[in-house]
Interface confidence: low
């Protein structure tokens, strides 16, 4: 079974996202992975996209994230663009219109992205073998 190119794109984007920290990668997001035993793969992707959308919607123009230097500003802008791309690709992979995100647990964005990367790499290894 050939791996979906969208999956490869997601992994590539996650690699870029986890390579460099920004002022706001330590901010918290809803941890949808904390209790996802009864969740389908598509629901997980949809909920992950929802969490990312909530994050970039709230913090795209957050002055704390934009920082005081040109480099901090550029890195945050790049983070938001990658999150948007990730959102779209996850949304396309999920194929669902909406999904609830009700978990109380929190995780840093950095840890959330690392966890998502692990899941995506596992999925890729299965479909490429």
């Amino acid at each position: 079974h050939k791996c979906d190119i969208t999956l490869q794109e997601i992994i590539k984007t996650l690699n870029s996202l986890t390579e460099q920290k920004t002022l706001c990668t330590e901010l918290t997001v809803t941890d949808i992975f904390a209790a996802s035993k009864n969740t389908t793969e598509k629901e997980t992707f949809c909920r992950a996209a929802t969490v990312l959308r909530q994050f970039y919607s709230h913090h795209e123009k957050d002055t704390r994230c934009l920082g005081a230097t040109a480099q901090q500003f550029h890195r945050h802008k790049q983070l938001i663009r990658f999150l948007k791309r990730l959102d779209r690709n996850l949304w396309g992979l999920a194929g669902l219109n909406s999904c609830p995100v009700k978990e109380a647990n929190q995780s840093t964005l950095e840890n959330f992205l690392e966890r998502l990367k692990t899941i995506m790499r596992e999925k890729y290894s299965k479909c490429s073998s």
Epitope: I5, T6, R88, W91, G92, G95
Partner: antibody, heavy 123, light 106 residues
């Protein structure tokens, strides 16, 4: 097959807001994994991407136009719209709506285009 | 913002000639590049996506190559119906079109 049709006034006065609508027929505007964009072309010049709206509802705008642009979708009417505020003569162009994302990636090529509508900014 | 520089801006060639257009990105865009054909008074038409993939229904005389910052679009044997302006477009970060190359028949 899927078709796109732009509509709106052909003449807009300077400092006013340009409003265009793109009606999608032959398919649903909510279809995964497509997205929708606006591109313009001033007379005798090249193509300029204005902005796009995605199934998630998120938007991307050309940084040079971002402060003046709003793109929205009305799924009930199978339409998406462009609003460009504070127009000047430099905004005179043929405005195209287009569908994107029709290949293996979500961010992708604009593969279906409307025929374009000429908008002149003049008093 | 990523800038796309297309060259030449115009060219004139004979029917049957091999025509080559280049597009250079201001930074590495992998293969996130498309090529479009626009005939006078018409909307652009997608010819090549992902730098080298031929869109369904497009004649095989059209081809694309390249990765990173340098890309090439080729018409192996120019036909009268190929008279048009050709544009490259990157989608690595937002979307930017090249300035266009107008192709005419000698």
């Amino acid at each position: 097959q899927l078709q796109l049709q732009e509509s709106g006034p052909g003449l807009v006065k300077p400092s006013e807001t340009l409003s265009l609508t793109c009606t999608v027929s032959g398919g649903s505007i909510s279809s995964i994994p497509y997205y929708w964009g606006w591109i313009r072309q001033p007379p005798g010049k090249g193509l300029e991407w204005i902005g796009s709206i995605y199934p998630s509802g998120s938007t991307d705008y050309n940084p040079s136009l971002k402060s003046r642009v709003t793109i929205s979708v009305d799924t009930s009417k199978n339409q998406f719209s462009l609003k460009l505020s504070s127009v000047t003569a430099a905004d005179t162009a043929v405005y195209y709506c287009a569908r994107g994302g029709a290949r293996d990636r979500i961010d992708h090529a604009f593969d279906i285009w409307g025929q374009g509508t000429m908008v002149t900014v003049s008093s | 913002d990523i800038q796309m520089t297309q060259s030449p801006s115009s060219l004139s060639a004979s029917v049957g000639d091999r025509v080559t257009i280049t597009c250079q990105a201001s930074q590495d865009i992998s293969n996130y590049l498309n090529w479009y054909q626009q005939k006078p008074g018409k909307a652009p038409k997608l010819l090549i996506y992902d730098a080298s993939n031929l869109e369904t229904g497009v004649p095989s005389r059209f081809s694309g190559s390249g990765s990173g910052t340098d890309f090439t679009f080729t018409i192996s044997s120019l036909q009268p119906e190929d008279i048009a302006t050709y544009y490259c477009q990157q989608y690595y970060d937002l979307y930017t079109f090249g300035g266009g190359t107008k192709v005419e028949i000698k």
